[in-house]
């Protein structure tokens, strides 16, 4: 417990103290004040250094004396033979004798009192930073105007800390600039502009004036700029020794200034400003920026457009274009989105054609699409070469977007009619050899396929029954083979206005227009033994000439039979009509003069009684087509004659084209466009 | 199929916060950006912001910056919005949406209810 | 922020009809607006984006037309299952924003 005041005697005092003895006091004043030791006697073994007998007095670690031998007072008005002084509150005595003593020796007698120190003045180390204040058993620090005493009751500081800048311009600076900062400060500034700002600071070298580093390097009053997880700093020294424009990229940003004690400048000031975040100008692959600029910043927006043949896709939706706005964070929006290659997709299919799986139908692809040749060819032309375009399309050279349209080759036979052994008016055939030849069973008679939809025939065969029944791809006609072959089923006859109907067909005279079209529900699947013929041309290439040849095929009445069961075929020439006018009708059921002959008629046969008879009727009387050699047209229709196996009439198929197109193209089906 | 499912109503008292979820299935959400949008009773669409899922990248409508919190987790294919310090304004309906070009898709929304 | 304001909060219109709503911006936004349809009790339905392009199985009733500050949505022949509210909004930049919704009714 520590006491103001006390007494310290050595043992026995004041008979002789005994040998090898070891004593010590401690001595304990209150916090605040210091001791003052002092003796009234003193009577120990004189020895050098005080080696054999001794009182030492020990403050702390420090050996404040020791003391031996005798002494007195020098002054007659006091008892005090030696003092001690300390200014710590703690004290420590130990007496020490050794093991003889020459002489008797009394010891010492000695008291201490609690005295006032002055921590203001006793102390190497100032207690205070600016004024210290002393008083009995203690102190206080005291600060000048402005200054403020720090929580440790020792140091003082300026309160410069606190201040929030908002504005998007601005000007810092330390206290009291330009006149010396203040010393053991520490000042926080804060800078918080709009997101979408940085906050960038600029410094002119002359402005900055703080203490040097120390010999280490490190600066022992100094500058720091925090932004985030940025830091730049820590400053110090004489001119700024950092960079003169630093931009933070943040948009929040704090200034720590750091003071100690000593070595005061003038400080520093500073200017700051926002500057719209930047964006970086992104490289994206294929598009193109709008506004294009070198520099792009917060609130920004670019039109980022693709390239041809690029798209953005959005599930099953594209588009060519999309903005995109430099943001408050320094990112752009929608980066995400990457123009990538137009996709064409699965290439649609044709009918009578085909198109080979593609590699790839990314924009650029190509593709070919192919006829199923030799039946098929491509009627629009352009090649049949696609590529994958722009805008997401397989477009061709010629017809853009348009499919190709492989129609049936008309006209070529895939076995050439060669006339064998003589048969009574003709040969036997194969449908190879007339692949457009259609059999008709009520009435039994034929007709010529003109293309996948049509039939051309005589007018005289359909007009008793507007629904035939139609077979194609069969040499013979046998029930057996017909269940076989393709039967056809008629959507409609169209009957040429110019043909006369009358009550009682059996009694015609006048064969004029004796020409029919019927039109099939479905379309007819092209081949070896199915294949249309072709229609003459309306040029002067296309009129007959005397003697020019043609052939006619069917399973009409022959020589030996009413009907034919196989094919047959005849190579006739073209005769003048006065050739047919002169035969006799054979079973006329009319006056010879009542039979009407017609420049819409051509006269055939007339050779070694080679001619068509009943039931070959509406089957194309097939010439050579002068501009294509490989190519047979329809010149003629079987039509009426005066009797079998002379001359024949056949209806001029060229006089009809223009009906026969109008009619086809009035009543096709969307299928067929 | 493109679907996005909300997690179920809530009701909650004022001062607390909720999270909402909205899992994807039918597309990753890492090739779009997912939107949270409020809708007070009777009242219009308010968009509160997206998130990348690719990169955490977020972006808010200044308004709700500090309100709302857009978060995902990319290996459960799944996006978040977490409202803190709820007050009866925060009562509405929130839908997430998925978008590239524009909110193609939307939840079927989450009803909220702050009520002491 | 961008303000999308759509003029009328109601229209009334009978099947049959042509009906179109109007959305302004209150600055350039290009042709960045889609228009939504939102009946009630569900979520929002993308109807138009980009101004005027149709939505993937949106009938060719819904059109859109605009570009720059004014906007228009029209639906020509109205169905008695168009009974929705119509928003329109903006993506041409962050915040995206809204229109306040024009709510169609049937009479």
């Known amino acids: 417990e520590p006491t103001m005041y006390g007494e310290i005697l050595s043992p026995n005092y004041p008979q002789a103290y005994p040998s090898e003895v070891e004593k010590s006091w401690d001595i304990e004043v209150p916090e605040g004040y210091g001791i003052h030791l002092y003796f009234t006697h003193l009577d120990i073994e004189l020895s050098e250094n005080c080696a054999y007998d001794s009182v030492q007095i020990i403050s702390g670690d420090t050996e404040e004396g020791r003391l031996c031998g005798q002494r007195s007072s020098n002054n007659p008005h006091s008892p005090i033979v030696e003092e001690f002084q300390v200014p710590y509150n703690k004290l420590q005595v130990i007496f020490k004798s050794d093991f003889s003593n020459e002489e008797r020796f009394t010891g010492f007698a000695a008291y201490y009192v609690a005295t006032d120190i002055n921590e203001c003045t006793d102390f190497v180390d100032v207690p205070c930073s600016h004024f210290c204040n002393n008083f009995i058993g203690g102190y206080f620090c005291s600060c000048p105007p402005e200054y403020f005493l720090h929580d440790d009751m020792k140091n003082c500081g300026v309160n410069c800390s606190g201040d929030v800048f908002t504005a998007l311009i601005g000007e810092i600076a330390s206290p009291n600039y330009p006149k010396p900062y203040p010393e053991n400060s520490r000042c926080e500034y804060q800078i918080r502009l709009e997101k979408g700002f940085q906050v960038v600071v600029t410094l002119r070298r002359e402005d900055f004036d703080v203490e040097a580093a120390d010999s280490a390097g490190n600066c022992l009053d100094s500058l720091v700029f925090v932004a985030g997880d940025r830091q730049f700093g820590p400053y110090c020294g004489h001119g700024f020794p950092g960079p003169l424009n630093i931009e933070t990229k943040s948009n929040a940003l704090d200034i720590i200034f750091q003071t100690d004690l000593t070595g005061q400048k003038k400080g520093w000031k500073l200017r700051y400003h926002g500057d719209p975040m930047p964006c970086p100008k992104e490289d994206t692959p294929n598009s193109v920026w709008e506004p294009a600029k070198a520099k792009y910043v917060f609130r920004d927006v670019v039109q980022i457009t693709c390239l041809d043949g690029f798209e953005v896709v959005e599930g099953r939706v594209g588009a060519t274009s999309f903005y995109s706005t430099c943001q408050s964070n320094g990112k752009w929006s929608n980066s995400k989105l990457k123009c990538q290659p137009v996709d064409c997709g699965i290439p649609e299919s044709i009918e009578n054609g085909k198109v080979e799986d593609p590699e790839s139908t990314l924009f650029g692809s190509v593709i070919r699409y192919t006829c199923e040749e030799p039946y098929y060819y491509m009627e629009n032309g352009g090649g049949g070469e696609y590529h994958c375009a722009g805008n997401g399309s397989w477009v061709n050279e010629v017809l853009g977007p348009e499919l190709p349209k492989c129609v049936p080759v008309c006209g070529v036979p895939r076995e050439p009619f060669e006339e064998k052994q003589r048969i009574i008016g003709g040969s036997d055939a194969d449908i190879k050899n007339f692949p457009w030849q259609v059999f008709f069973d009520n009435p039994w008679a034929g007709g010529a396929l003109i293309n996948e939809y049509w039939v051309l025939t005589a007018a005289h065969v359909v007009e008793g029954n507007r629904e035939p029944t139609m077979y194609v791809g069969s040499t013979s006609v046998q029930t057996s083979r017909l269940a076989k072959s393709k039967m056809l089923t008629p959507e409609h006859v169209f009957i040429h206005p110019g043909w006369k109907l009358l009550e009682v067909p059996e009694g015609r005279t006048n064969f004029d227009n004796d020409i029919a079209l019927v039109r099939l529900k479905d379309p007819v699947k092209m081949g070896p033994t199915v294949s249309p013929i072709c229609l003459p041309g309306t040029s002067s290439d296309y009129n007959l000439m005397d003697g020019d040849l043609g052939l006619i095929s069917g399973w009409g009445r022959t020589e030996k039979r009413d009907r034919a069961v196989r094919l047959k075929a005849a190579r006739l020439p073209v005769a003048p009509l006065r050739k047919c006018k002169e035969v006799k009708v054979e079973k006329p059921t009319a006056d010879a003069e009542a039979y009407v002959f017609t420049p819409n008629m051509i006269c055939a046969g007339g050779e070694k009684g080679m001619d068509s008879c009943k039931g070959d009727s509406g089957g194309a009387f097939a010439v050579q087509d002068p501009n294509d050699k490989t190519k047979f047209y329809a010149a003629g229709l079987v039509s009426w004659g005066p009797q079998c196996g002379t001359y024949g009439l056949y209806t001029r198929v060229k006089n009809y084209v223009d009906w026969i197109m109008k009619t086809m193209q009035e009543n096709s089906t969307p299928r067929e466009d | 199929e493109v679907q996005l499912q909300q997690s179920g109503a809530e009701l909650v008292r004022p001062g607390a916060l909720v999270k909402l979820s909205c899992k994807a299935s039918?597309?990753?959400?890492?090739?779009?950006?997912m939107h949270w949008v409020k809708q007070r009773p009777e009242q219009g669409l308010e968009w509160i912001g997206w998130?990348?899922?690719?990169?955490?990248?977020?972006i808010y409508d200044p308004k709700f910056q500090g309100k709302a919190s857009i978060t995902a987790d990319t290996s459960s294919n799944t996006a978040y919005l977490q409202l803190s310090s709820l007050t009866s304004e925060d009562t509405a309906v929130y839908y997430c949406?998925?978008?590239?070009?524009?909110?193609?898709?939307w939840g079927q929304g989450t009803l909220v209810t702050v009520s002491a | 922020d961008i303000v999308m304001t759509q003029s009328h909060k109601f229209m009334s219109t009978s099947v049959g009809d042509r009906v179109s709503f109007t959305c302004k911006a209150s600055?350039?936004?290009?042709?960045?607006v889609d228009w939504y349809q939102q009946k009630p009790g569900q979520s929002p339905k993308l109807l138009i984006y980009?101004?005027?392009y149709r939505y993937t199985g949106v009938p060719d009733r819904f059109t859109g037309t605009g570009s720059g500050t004014d906007f228009t949505f029209t639906i020509s022949s109205v169905q008695a299952e168009d009974l929705a509210v119509y928003f329109c909004?903006?993506?041409?930049?962050?915040?995206?924003?809204f229109g306040g919704g024009t709510k169609l009714e049937i009479k």
């Open positions: 909004q903006q993506q041409y930049t962050t915040p995206y924003t």
């Open positions: 600055q350039d936004v290009r042709t960045a």
């Open positions: 949406a998925r978008s590239r070009l524009f909110f193609a898709y």
């Open positions: 980009s101004a005027s």
């Open positions: 998130i990348d899922p690719e990169n955490g990248d977020t």
């Open positions: 039918g597309f990753n959400i890492k090739e779009y950006y």
